[in-house]
């Protein structure tokens, strides 16, 4: 079989379930610093009608609030529309549904355009295995290693997970 790694084998449904945020990257460092709008952490995901539904954890006032977001499908298989702090074109850049997922977003907010990338894994004990893949995606969207933030347990709202 030859082709392209466009979508998860078996479709978006394979992305359903629990995920853990491992790393973030952005060309605007403030967005992913503590209290930045995109310093958010994945809790779980599900897919329905080609749309992606995500529960994310947002640090607020020393606690973590769970918020549900929906990324709506577009005519392009790996692209979704997401409204969160402005409009986001969300792309699935590299996916292995059983192991890891790398997405990036082009955010438009108040006439300002930003780039944010996110690495999430199924099993936190294997997070180091997928950082090279994340660095590769970041390079290919014009982000540098020094623009990547690798998260710690304290960062990612681990205490808020059920």
């Amino acid at each position: 079989q030859e082709g392209n790694h466009e979508e998860p084998q078996g479709g978006l449904e394979e992305l359903s379930g629990r995920w853990h945020s491992v790393a973030l990257a952005s060309n605007k460092s403030d967005l992913i610093k503590p209290w930045g709008h995109f310093r958010v952490f994945i809790h779980s995901m599900s897919a329905k009608d080609g749309n992606l539904h995500g529960d994310i954890l947002i640090p607020q006032d020393g606690q973590c609030e769970k918020v549900s977001l929906t990324a709506f499908k577009t005519a392009t298989s790996n692209k979704f529309d997401l409204e969160y702090w402005g409009h986001n074109d969300l792309y699935l850049a590299e996916v292995d549904p059983k192991s890891y997922l790398i997405l990036y977003m082009i955010n438009q907010y108040n006439d300002d355009t930003s780039l944010v990338a996110h690495l999430m894994v199924r099993d936190l004990s294997r997070q180091q295995d997928f950082l090279p893949a994340f660095e590769s995606v970041c390079e290919d969207i014009g982000l540098h290693k020094d623009q990547i933030v690798v998260l710690s347990d304290d960062d990612r709202c681990q205490g808020s997970r059920d």
């Epitope: 079989q1 790694h5 590299e94 590769s136 290919d140």
Partner: nanobody, 121 residues
Amino acid sequence: EVQLVESGGGLVQPGGSLRLSCAASGTIFLINRMGWYRQAPGKQRELVATSFTSGNSTMYADSVKGRFTISRDNAKKTVYLQMNSLKPEDTAVYYCKARISRRYGNWDDYWGQGTQVTVSS
């Protein structure tokens, strides 16, 4: 083994055009991203353009937006870079990069050997 072979470089006058090609060959199961980078003398390598998966999603460096177009032919495992309105500052060695799986679940980055583009009158 996987090989990336670039072609299409050369000498062109300012305002001119060139089309670069990069063909992947060898043991290939899947190809994800294909893209172009460049390195000018004394400078760091920089991203020019990337084509994600089927080519519906692309990313360009600000310096080439509106002048360069990346495209790909998946059947031929080839990525192209159409460069128009070339400027002297586009002079560099242009490298192809591809994210390739030789078997399911294993991804690696592969680079071509580079092709020289010189923009000069």
